[in-house]
Interface confidence: low
C-alpha cells in the first residue's frame, strides 16, 4: 500500500495514527471517529489542550496514547464521552498535573505518565496512591515530580478531602413537620459541594439554600417515608471526594399485619411491623402471653436499608395440635400501639377420634446419647406421629 | 470501636528473632496504614516503618531496613512486625499504630521486648 | 532524615501555669503532630496538623508555627496534663520524633 500523506492515518480495522510533525492542535473531526478503538498521537507539539469537546462521538475508544507532544492540560471531564478507556498513555508531554476527576468513572487497566515535568502537590495525592496501591502499572513507572524528588516520597499529611460534618435536628421530627439540615465543609482547596437527594421522591418538599462551607438543606413537610432515606452532602477538593450520609428519623405510630401460617423449613407465621422509633413486640398465644424459647421464637428477615417496615416470622419448630390457636402480636413504641390476631392450625387433635376408628399412636424413643431426658425426634420413622407436649 | 491490641511481653537471646502481631477491631484494617514504633527504656519513640494493608507496600526506616520486615494477614485482620538479629539494644516497648489522613490516630498498648543471655 | 530538636527537655511547672513546649526541625515540615505518653501507656494524639486537636483533646491545648519552628502550648496546666510530650514529623521518610519534654510538677 502506498504511504498515506494524511496527518491520521487508519491503523489496523479500528485504529488511527497521527504521527506527522505538528500536523494537529486539536482531535476535532478524526476521520471514522465513532469506531475508533485505538488512536495513536505522537509528535503533535501544538496539540496542548486536551478537553471535552476533543473526544465527543469517540465512544468506543479503549486505547489512547498522545505521546512526545506539547500536552499541558486535560480536562477534569475530557473522558467523560469515552467511558470504556482501558489504556492511557499521555508520556512526554508538558503535563504539570492531571485531576482525580479526569480517571474518575474509567476502569483504567493502564495510565502511563512518565516524563512530564509533574509538580508535586496535593493535587497528584490520588496518582501517589495509585503508586502506593499498585494501580495502573503506575509504580513501574517511578514518577518523579519535576525538581522535587520521587512522587513516593511527596509528603501528603495535609493531603486530605474535604471533611463534612451534617447536623441533623435532636428532636423528634414529626410527619408535616420541616426539617433543616446544615453541612458544614471544610478542608483546603474547596472547589464545589452540594446535595444528592435521589432517594427522597416524594419524602418532603426540599429546598436548597446557602454556599460553601455552609450548605442549607430544608425538607418540608416529611412524610413517614423519609426514614432510612438517605440525604448525602458532598464535597471535592483536588485530592478527592468526600460523601457523607444521614438520615432523618420521622416518628410515627406502631402498625402490625400477621398472616397466615406456612410451613417453610418450619412452620412461620409471617408478619410485618412498622414504625418510629421501631416497635416492641409481644405475642400471645389465646389471649396469654407467649414466652419464647427456642422452638417459639420471633425471627427477623434481613431488613432492607431503605424502608422502617421489617418482615419476620413467629417460626414453631414440629409444632402439634397444642399449637393450634389463636395467635395476636402486638407492637407498641410511643407514638402508638397496634395488634393483629390470626387463628392458625397445625395439626388435628389426635385425641379426636371416633371410637370406631383405630389409633394409630407412636412415640420416638429416647437417645441414649442425649444429655437431656427429652425425646429426639426421628424423622420418616413412621408416616403419623403423636407428640405429648407438657406445658 | 477502635482497637489495636498486640501480641504479649517476649524475653529474646541475642541473635534471636522476634515477632509481634497487632489484630485490628472497629475499622476496615484494609483502609489504614500501618506503623510500628519503638521505645526503649526512658528513651523517645523511634519509628521503625509502615505497611498498608491494601497493597502490601511497606516503607522501612533505613536504620532497620535489614533486620526489620513488616507483613500483614488481611483475613484476620492483623499485623505483624519481625525484628531478626537481635541486640541488647533492642530491649524495648514495640507499638503499633494506624493512620488514614492523619498521623498514628491510635496506637495498640505497646509489646515489651526483652533481649539478654 | 529530618531531625526534630525538642526544648526544653524537661520542664517543672504548677497547676494552672502556662507551659510552652517548641520543636525545632532540621528542615522545613509542612505540618507538626504532637503525642502526650504517661508513664507505661502508649502516646496518644493531641494535635496533629500543627494545630488542629485531636478528638478529646481539651481546649486549654493549642499548637502554632511553620516551617522548621513548633510551639505546643498548654494554657493552663491541669494535674493530669503532667506527662511526657513528643513532636513528629510526617512530612517525609523516616517518620521522626523529638527527643520529648518531660512536664514534672514544681
Known amino acids: 500500500a502506498a504511504p498515506c500523506p494524511d496527518a491520521c492515518c487508519p491503523h489496523g480495522s479500528s485504529g488511527l495514527r497521527c504521527t506527522r510533525d505538528g500536523a494537529l492542535d486539536s482531535l476535532h473531526h478524526l476521520p471514522g471517529a465513532e469506531n475508533l478503538t485505538e488512536l495513536y498521537i505522537e509528535n503533535q507539539q501544538h496539540l496542548q489542550h486536551l478537553e471535552l469537546r476533543d473526544l465527543r462521538g469517540l465512544g468506543e475508544l479503549r486505547n489512547l496514547t498522545i505521546v512526545k507532544s506539547g500536552l499541558r492540560f486535560v480536562a477534569p471531564d475530557a473522558f467523560h464521552f469515552t467511558p470504556r478507556l482501558s489504556r492511557l498513555n499521555l508520556s512526554f508531554n508538558a503535563l504539570e498535573s492531571l485531576s482525580w476527576k479526569t480517571v474518575q468513572g474509567l476502569s483504567l487497566q493502564e495510565l502511563v505518565l512518565s516524563g512530564n515535568p509533574l509538580h508535586c502537590s496535593c493535587a497528584l495525592r490520588w496518582l501517589q496512591r495509585w503508586e502506593e496501591e499498585g494501580l495502573g502499572g503506575v509504580p513501574e513507572q517511578k514518577l518523579q515530580c519535576h525538581g522535587q524528588g520521587p512522587l513516593a516520597h511527596m509528603p501528603n499529611a495535609s493531603c486530605g478531602v474535604p471533611t463534612l460534618k451534617v447536623q441533623v435536628p435532636n428532636a423528634s421530627v414529626d410527619v408535616g413537620d420541616d426539617v433543616l439540615l446544615r453541612c458544614q465543609v471544610e478542608g483546603r482547596g474547596l472547589e464545589q459541594a452540594g446535595w444528592i437527594l435521589t432517594e427522597l421522591e416524594q419524602s418532603a418538599t426540599v429546598m436548597k439554600s446557602g454556599g460553601l462551607p455552609s450548605l442549607g438543606l430544608t425538607l418540608a413537610n416529611v412524610t413517614s417515608d423519609l426514614n432510612r432515606k438517605n440525604v448525602t452532602c458532598w464535597a471535592e477538593n483536588d485530592v478527592g471526594r468526600a460523601e457523607v450520609s444521614v438520615q432523618v428519623n420521622v416518628s410515627f405510630p406502631a402498625s402490625v399485619q400477621l398472616h397466615t401460617a406456612v410451613e417453610m423449613h418450619h412452620w412461620c407465621i409471617p408478619f410485618s411491623v412498622d414504625g418510629q422509633p421501631a416497635p416492641s413486640l409481644r405475642w400471645l398465644f389465646n389471649g396469654s402471653v407467649l414466652n419464647e424459647t427456642s422452638f417459639i421464637f420471633t425471627e427477623f428477615l434481613e431488613p432492607a436499608a431503605n424502608e422502617t417496615v421489617r418482615h419476620g416470622c413467629l417460626r414453631l419448630n414440629q409444632p402439634t395440635h397444642v399449637n393450634n390457636g389463636n395467635y395476636t402480636l402486638l407492637a407498641a413504641n410511643p407514638f402508638g400501639q397496634a395488634s393483629a390476631s390470626i387463628m392458625a392450625a397445625f395439626m388435628d387433635n389426635p385425641f379426636e377420634f371416633n371410637p370406631e376408628d383405630p389409633i394409630p399412636v407412636s412415640f420416638s424413643p429416647v437417645d441414649t446419647n442425649s444429655t437431656s431426658g427429652d425425646p429426639v425426634e426421628k424423622k420418616d420413622e413412621t408416616p403419623f406421629g403423636v407428640s405429648v407436649a407438657v406445658g | 470501636q477502635v482497637q489495636l491490641v498486640q501480641s504479649g511481653a517476649e524475653v529474646k537471646k541475642p541473635g534471636a528473632s522476634v515477632k509481634v502481631s497487632c489484630k485490628s477491631s472497629?475499622?476496615?484494617?484494609?483502609?489504614?496504614?500501618m506503623h510500628w514504633v519503638r521505645q526503649a527504656p526512658g528513651q523517645g519513640l523511634e519509628w521503625m516503618g509502615e505497611?498498608?494493608?491494601?497493597?502490601?507496600?511497606?516503607n522501612y526506616n533505613e536504620k532497620f531496613k535489614n533486620r526489620v520486615t513488616m507483613t500483614v494477614d488481611i483475613s484476620i485482620s492483623t499485623a505483624y512486625m519481625e525484628l531478626s538479629r537481635l541486640r541488647s539494644d533492642d530491649t524495648a516497648v514495640y507499638y503499633c499504630?494506624?493512620?488514614?489522613?492523619?498521623?498514628?490516630?491510635?496506637w495498640g498498648q505497646g509489646t515489651t521486648v526483652t533481649v539478654s543471655s | 532524615d529530618v531531625q526534630l530538636t525538642q526544648s526544653p527537655s524537661s520542664l517543672s511547672a504548677s497547676v494552672g501555669d502556662r507551659v510552652t513546649i517548641t520543636c525545632s526541625a532540621s528542615?522545613?515540615?509542612?505540618?507538626m503532630h504532637w503525642y502526650q505518653q504517661k508513664p507505661g501507656k502508649a502516646p496518644k494524639r493531641l494535635i496533629y496538623?500543627?494545630?488542629k486537636l485531636a478528638s478529646g483533646v481539651p481546649s486549654r491545648f493549642s499548637g502554632s508555627g511553620s516551617g522548621t519552628d513548633y510551639t505546643l502550648t498548654i494554657s493552663s496546666l491541669q494535674p493530669e496534663d503532667f506527662a511526657t510530650y513528643f513532636c513528629?514529623?510526617?512530612?517525609?521518610?523516616?517518620?521522626?520524633f523529638g527527643q520529648g519534654t518531660r512536664l514534672e510538677i514544681k
Open positions: 499504630a494506624r493512620s488514614r489522613y492523619d498521623p498514628m490516630e491510635d
Open positions: 472497629g475499622y476496615t484494617f484494609t483502609n489504614y496504614w
Open positions: 505497611i498498608y494493608p491494601n497493597s502490601g507496600r511497606v
Open positions: 528542615s522545613s515540615v509542612g505540618y
Open positions: 496538623d500543627t494545630s
Open positions: 513528629q514529623q510526617w512530612s517525609s521518610i523516616p517518620l521522626t
